[in-house]
């Protein structure tokens, strides 16, 4: 049993290393920036995010392309809830430094939680997304 779990753990690690989660990060960043645009951005806090969407992306086509690529990547974790959780936490960690303020962080987290469902996948059950950057040791 333990041996099987160690093998499963290694498989998850290699899956995570192979996965390109960047499209997920781009899709989520564009999504929350589009939401900010619809609700009106603070004119005194221009976006400094490197993923700031182009006018083409703002119409949604670029983002839907990112979403499709993102879902393809997440699909690899469909049969491993723990690994799905790891992937989502990795996305959260990668973006935590780029999120400006508590509100944007909460918005990003909300969209991240909905991501598996948007991809037609099952959301992980025991999965804490309240991740602090740099605060966790790896499996």
């Amino acid at each position: 049993r333990q041996q099987w779990e160690l093998q499963g753990d290694r498989r998850c690690q290699s899956q995570l290393e192979r996965a390109n989660l960047r499209p997920c990060e781009q899709h989520l960043m564009q999504k929350i920036q589009r939401d900010e645009d619809s609700y009106g951005r603070d004119p005194y806090s221009p976006s400094q995010d490197p993923y700031s969407p182009s006018p083409y992306d703002r119409r949604g086509a670029g983002s839907s392309q990112h979403q499709e690529r993102c879902c393809n990547e997440l699909n690899e974790f469909e049969n491993n809830q723990r690994c799905m959780c790891e992937a989502l936490q990795q996305i959260m960690e990668n973006q935590s430094d780029r999120l400006q303020g508590r509100q944007q962080e909460q918005q990003f987290k909300r969209e991240l939680r909905n991501l598996p469902q948007q991809c037609g996948l099952r959301a992980p059950q025991r999965c804490d997304l309240e991740v602090e950057s740099g605060g966790r040791d790896r499996y």
Partner: antibody
Framework: EVQLVESGGALVQPGGSLRLSCAAS????????MTWIRQAPGKGLEWVAN????????DYLDSVRGRFNISRDNAKSVLYLQMNTLSADDTGVYYC????????????????WGQGILVTVSS | QSVLTQPPSVSAAPGQKVTISCSGT????????VSWYQQLPGTAPKLLIY???KRPSGIPDRFSGSKSGTSATLGITGLQTGDEADYYC???????????FGGGTKLTVL
């Protein structure tokens, strides 16, 4: 008011069997995970087993897997723990608890506990 | 030997603040939610904190929970003699597919 009442505790010989029951009331039993937790005399808490709302998934402490079986009767709002091949290490107070675990992005937590029932394994 | 490590005992005077730590690994606290329980002598445990920081209704705001990395902390302010009890942390461990409890911490109010 949520109530969990355990029964079936006894003094049993090593190698023997026992079935604990937990009658639940005051909440919709079929919508909650349920959990057994035990505490050896003078020791800390030890999780024993979880069962999903519909009984389709069960998790066990390694040392009881294959000997204990957790089950539930949602029509009667009763949780069970069938314990076989008992040893002195299984001695303690067994608590029936309601587990707040949800379907996604949630953790196990035990928001209601029974009063506990004593199981003693001794010759 | 519990996989979640808590100090065996802590003590403080009435009115003071105390913190109880719970240390784990990436496969438990690092990825999962932590809950905290109070067990008064001779009684069943009671839930104090769940999902790292949330308090069930009826639990005073003197009790607080936090989590950072692979450690969690229970804070109790305005200590009262009635807080003398054993305190336990708990979380799911993905390696073991099991809920783990810490070894427990005995709080003495001097």
């Amino acid at each position: 008011e949520v109530q969990l009442v355990e029964s079936g505790g006894a003094l049993v010989q090593p190698g023997g069997s026992l079935r604990l029951s937990c009658a639940a009331s005051g909440f919709k039993f079929s919508t909650f995970y349920m959990t057994w937790i035990r505490q050896a005399p003078g020791k800390g808490l030890e999780w024993v087993a979880n069962i999903k709302q519909d009984g389709s998934e069960k998790d066990y402490l390694d040392s009881v897997r294959g000997r204990f079986n957790i089950s539930r009767d949602n029509a009667k709002s009763v949780l069970y723990l069938q314990m076989n091949t008992l040893s002195a290490d299984d001695t303690g107070v067994y608590y029936c608890t309601r587990n707040g675990l949800q379907d996604s992005y949630s953790g196990d937590f035990f928001d209601h506990w029974g009063q506990g029932i004593l199981v003693t394994v001794s010759s | 030997q519990s996989v979640l490590t808590q100090p065996p005992s802590v003590s403080a005077a009435p009115g003071q603040k105390v913190t109880i730590s719970c240390s784990g690994t990436g496969s438990n606290i690092g990825h999962n939610y932590v809950s905290w329980y109070q067990q008064l002598p001779g009684t069943a445990p009671k839930l104090l904190i769940y999902d790292n920081t949330k308090r069930p209704s009826g639990i005073p705001d003197r009790f607080s929970g936090s989590k950072s990395g692979t450690s969690a902390t229970l804070g109790i302010t305005g200590l009262q003699t009635g807080d003398e009890a054993d305190y336990y942390c708990a979380t799911w461990d993905a390696d073991l597919s099991a809920v783990l409890f810490g070894g427990g911490t005995k709080l003495t109010v001097l």
